[in-house]
């Protein structure tokens, strides 16, 4: 469960994150599992540990093996394992399956290809992108931040996409490449008038004074990518940001896509330390898209504490 596969090419940078997470203040020790030898933290070493990250600058085939990371806090230790494999560079164009990151699929309306693992590196734009080893050229291809956008996607756009970037460590530059497959699906999307799944219209939500309360506004809009679709909360007909009560905040929930393909959105309203005056407010869950606006109103009522007297 706490073991992670990582791979890279010789003479390229490889950075691996410890599969066990901890606060930034926790110390992380790294070991080479076969020898139980500690990985140094000094940056002058080709392979060194830097907190949660293990850096191979650059990597060598001989670095392959299992590395142990131990996250140490004042109260506990957590152990994780990084299974690292460094491969020799291929002379031909083919990228073998074992070097491929997860496949992504796109459609005419949504064609972003993210460069895998790039967040671990200190890189600067622009990224270089290749398809089946050919540099991508033409206005249909746009490298933006850490992803590639393809305009007007066609079935011929399916294939293996490689991103190439430079990692900078203390003034030294190291090349990194990562490849993933892109498939094109025929997305027959549609858009509907919003349907609010929760809360029910005129729902009464019981809350306890002094406690925290959460209200979830959930709505579905159709199938596929939706335009101008949103769910949000209003208080007494006012945007949360304009209402000016710091105890009451809204937080985006999951962008859901159910097995039936419906595109749905959640927005959670968090009320900290519920006060009497909160019971007087009108809470509106709003769902909107191109077709219109639907509104469900909720009111809060005081939950009576259970009477423990006989």
């Amino acid at each position: 469960k706490f073991s992670k596969q990582s791979w890279g090419l010789e003479n390229e940078a490889l950075i691996v994150r410890c599969p066990r997470q901890g606060k930034p203040s926790y110390t992380v020790d790294w070991y080479y599992s076969q020898t139980n030898k500690s990985i140094p933290t000094q940056e002058r070493n080709r392979v060194f540990a830097s907190g949660q990250l293990l850096k191979f600058l650059p990597a060598a085939v001989a670095d392959s093996g299992i590395y142990t990371c131990i996250v140490r806090s004042p109260t506990f230790n957590r152990t994780g394992y990084a299974n690292v494999t460094i491969y020799k560079k291929q002379s031909d164009c083919n990228v073998p399956d074992y070097l491929m990151y997860s496949t992504v699929s796109g459609s005419e309306k949504n064609s972003k290809i993210y460069c895998p693992t790039i967040d671990l590196y200190n890189w600067t734009a622009p990224l270089e992108w290749f398809k089946n080893c050919q540099a991508l050229q033409g206005s249909r291809y746009r490298a933006h931040k850490s992803f590639l956008v393809i305009d007007n996607v066609m079935t011929e756009d399916a294939g293996d996409y490689t991103c190439k970037f430079i990692h900078n460590e203390n003034g030294a530059n190291y090349s990194v490449t990562a490849t993933r497959s892109f498939t094109v699906k025929d997305e027959q999307g549609f858009s509907l008038f919003p349907v609010i799944g929760a809360p029910a219209q005129n729902e009464i939500k019981e809350v306890e004074i002094g406690k925290n309360a959460n209200l979830t506004c959930s709505a579905c809009f159709g199938k596929g990518t939706q335009f101008l679709a949103a769910v949000l909360w209003q208080l007494n007909g006012t945007k949360i940001t304009d209402f000016g009560e710091p105890r009451i905040q809204q937080e985006e929930g999951q962008n859901q896509s159910f097995s039936n393909g419906l595109a749905c959105l959640d927005m959670v309203l968090r009320i900290a330390d519920v006060k009497e005056e909160d019971l007087l407010l009108q809470y509106d869950c709003l769902a909107l898209n191109l077709h219109g606006l639907r509104r469900h109103t909720v009111r809060l009522s005081r939950k009576n504490p259970i009477d423990h007297h006989s």
């Epitope: 858009s191 335009f227 945007k239 909107l288």
Partner: antibody, heavy 123, light 108 residues
Framework: QVQLVQSGAEVKKPGSSVKVSCKAS????????ISWVRQAPGQGLEWMGT????????DYAQKFQGRVTITADESTSTAYMELSSLRSEDTAVYYC????????????????WGRGTLVTVSS | EIVMTQSPATLSVSPGERATLSCRAS???????LAWYQQKPGQAPRLLIY???TRATGIPARFSGSGSGTEFTLTISSLQSEDFAVYYC?????????FGQGTKVEIK
């Protein structure tokens, strides 16, 4: 008389960003949706994206996704369009255009236009 | 995306004559979602027709729109000097909202 007043012409270098403003005078700004449409020299009209200021929600044509940001300030009745990573092909007149809200919802045609802002991208 | 194709690219008409402009959509759109605009050199577009056939406020009766499905028409019954301009159709049935490439109506 409702008007959409746009900011002045801009000359920009490739790779830079431009931010164009569109101020609504008269009428109720919060009851409009504002879209941005551009027109390259001698070319047709191209829709870029739309914002509904009342809800603070914006969305964009996929061609411009990641490169354009549309915002609105209800207090000044002003909408903004920022386009980054400019290239010579972005040389165009940029229009803001209004969609009015009827009793049911927004009518997504453009019933009022600003006079346009010429953005020239040149090294 | 829905591609809007206008024809002809240029239409030469004498003042007082009738002009018929065509707009074809690459897929069927409800007639409620088609608009026509007029644009004169150096000016912003101006809304003429929405919902395929409803004239916008202040638009003279000589402008009329018709059509449904994929075929739409803008008719100017008797061209006035101020009508010589470029005309664009636009679908707002589904995003991205798209415009035709325009028809230029010029004096014959």
């Amino acid at each position: 008389q409702v008007q959409l007043v746009q900011s002045g012409a801009e000359v920009k270098k490739p790779g830079s960003s431009v931010k164009v403003s569109c101020k609504a005078s008269g009428g109720t700004f919060s009851s409009y949706a504002i879209s941005w449409v551009r027109q390259a020299p001698g070319q047709g009209l191209e829709w870029m994206g739309t914002i509904i200021p009342m809800f603070g929600i914006a969305d964009y044509a996929q061609k411009f996704q990641g490169r354009v940001t549309i915002t609105a300030d209800e207090s000044t009745s002003t909408a903004y369009m920022e386009l980054s990573s400019l290239r010579s092909e972005d040389t165009a007149v940029y229009y803001c255009a209004r969609s009015s809200r009827s009793s049911s919802w927004y009518n997504w045609y453009f019933d009022l236009w600003g006079r346009g802002t010429l953005v020239t991208v040149s090294s | 995306e829905i591609v809007m194709t206008q024809s002809p690219a240029t239409l030469s008409v004498s003042p007082g004559e009738r002009a018929t402009l065509s707009c074809r959509a690459s897929q069927s759109i409800s007639s409620s979602y088609l608009a026509w605009y007029q644009q004169k050199p150096g000016q912003a577009p101006r809304l003429l027709i929405y919902g395929a056939s409803t004239r916008a406020t202040g638009i003279p009766a000589r402008f009329s729109g018709s059509g449904s499905g994929t075929e739409f028409t803008l008719t100017i019954s008797s061209l006035q000097s101020e009508d010589f301009a470029v005309y664009y159709c636009q679908q707002y049935y589904t995003t991205p909202w798209t415009f035709g490439q325009g028809t230029k109506v010029e004096i014959k």
